[in-house]
């Protein structure tokens, strides 16, 4: 997260760290007791490493009573996701067992009504992604409150040049933005999961390259079918 602040510890009990060989790779969001939603491209970066999910964490390194690392029983990328595009960039990870819920571990309600979030709405994005252009990684969870940007502006030739589909949404990126390592993390608007950080190699913090998020409401049928 660029230009953000350290999050209040455990105030985002849905927040997950998707890890490979014990290292943070991507963000994720607990959407059901045994399921974490993330970005499909995160798996590509995992290669053949052991994928696990850390829940209940604020610090990645320090011991915390609520922290627990879960093995992944099944990884289900969206069937239409492709390495060369950010379309359908969603991934569902089934934990090896149901998460132990508590104040620091709790699923987040996700949006099922397939309607765009109003531009100007302030939404929270959080993650353990890089906090500087130099690539500095934080130990503790960071967050930033960003306004949603209308799709027409996001699709301008000077911005994302028509790449933003109806199944995506954008948020402002003027010095404050999600970045590398935040992919798969949640964009939360008024207590409801609306978007998942896409995992392209987009430049971060540039006003003309807004953050791109996959709209979860557009994938309600797929999410429901996997979770069923």
């Amino acid at each position: 997260i660029l230009g953000g602040r350290e999050a209040e510890a455990h105030a985002r009990p849905y927040m997950a760290s998707v890890q490979v060989n014990g290292e943070h790779l991507c963000g994720g969001v607990l959407v059901a007791e045994q399921w974490v939603l993330s970005a499909a491209h995160c798996l590509e970066d995992a290669a053949d490493g052991k994928v696990q999910v850390l829940l209940g964490a604020h610090s990645l390194s320090q011991p915390e009573p609520s922290k627990r690392l879960y093995d992944v029983l099944r990884a289900v990328p969206h069937p239409d996701s492709r390495p060369d595009t950010i379309d359908h960039d969603l991934l569902l990870l089934q934990l090896s067992e149901k998460a132990t819920l508590g104040p620091a571990v709790r699923p987040l309600p996700w949006q099922r009504v397939d309607r765009d979030v109003e531009p100007g709405t302030l939404c929270d994005v959080a993650g353990w992604g890089i906090v500087s252009h130099a690539g500095r990684r934080p130990d503790r969870l960071q967050h930033v409150l960003l306004p949603v940007l209308d799709r027409a502006t996001c699709n301008r030739r000077t911005h994302h040049d028509g790449a933003i589909t109806q199944r995506m949404m954008c948020a402002e990126s003027n010095r404050r933005d999600s970045c590398k390592g935040d992919s798969g993390g949640p964009l939360v608007c008024g207590g409801v999961l609306e978007g998942v950080v896409t995992s392209g190699s987009r430049v971060c913090g540039n006003r003309k390259k807004p953050g791109i998020y996959t709209r979860v409401a557009s994938y309600a049928a797929w999410i429901d079918s996997v979770l069923a």
Partner: antibody, heavy 122, light 107 residues
């Protein structure tokens, strides 16, 4: 403690412009959105728009686009609202208010300025 | 825009009574609602955020409830300092519109 101090009352002529200020203290100015709200005499509250001092990002209620322009001066922790082409309909008390954040993504206007009265009269 | 319909517009009550003010949103606002109190000639003050949470320093006789499109503010055992106008405001999308207000007067 948090305090938002607004500039004094204004009496302006129709067609003119007026710039009112809101000086923030007691918190990190660049970290919080500042809103502006209009209240006509004896009436309810209308949201005009917000500005984020950390990036100068703004968002306006469609109704106030072209009427209000929001700016900030980070060096003095002051937010400004310029109201242009004034008519009697713009006679009102204008408040600045800070967005406070709660939990992961809830917010509300937690601190308000005392209000600035703008009277448009020839 | 989401419309916020507040009722009653005015009410006259005695000290010690309990009052309830309601606010109806034109669509689901997912508990993204605040309540404010405004005294004559003063700025509004935040009472409740996220539909049910009391802001710092607000007496416990105030309580917020509701979900979806229906919300209410309850004031138990009304005190003389509670008289004034009350407004709800949603934060689900833009613009974050206010209700028309409820004026609470002493009987």
């Amino acid at each position: 403690q948090v305090h938002l101090q607004q500039s004094g009352p204004e009496l302006v002529k129709p067609g003119a412009s007026v710039k009112i200020s809101c000086k923030a203290s007691g918190y990190t100015f660049i970290d919080y959105y500042i809103n502006w709200v209009k209240q006509r005499p004896g009436q309810g509250l209308e949201w005009i728009g917000w500005i984020f001092p950390g990036s100068d990002s703004t968002y306006y209620n469609e109704k106030f686009k072209g009427k209000a322009t929001l700016t900030v001066d980070k060096s003095s922790s002051t937010a400004y609202m310029l109201l242009s082409s004034l008519t009697s309909e713009d006679s009102a008390v204008y408040f600045c208010a800070r967005y406070g954040y709660y939990g992961s993504s809830f917010y509300a206007m937690d601190y308000w300025g005392q209000g600035t009265s703008v009277t448009v009269s020839s | 825009d989401i419309q916020m319909t507040q009722s009653p517009a005015s009410l006259s009550v005695s000290v010690g009574e309990t009052v309830t003010i309601t606010c109806r949103a034109s669509e689901n606002i997912y508990s993204n609602l605040a309540w404010y109190q405004q005294k004559q000639g003063k700025s509004p003050q935040l009472l409740v955020y996220a539909a049910t949470n009391l802001a710092d320093g607000v007496p416990s006789r105030f309580s917020g409830s509701g979900s979806g499109t229906q919300y209410s503010l309850k004031i138990n055992s009304l005190q003389s300092e509670d008289f004034g106008s009350y407004y709800c405001q949603h934060f689900w999308g833009t613009p974050p519109t206010f209700g028309g207000g409820s004026k609470l007067e002493i009987k």
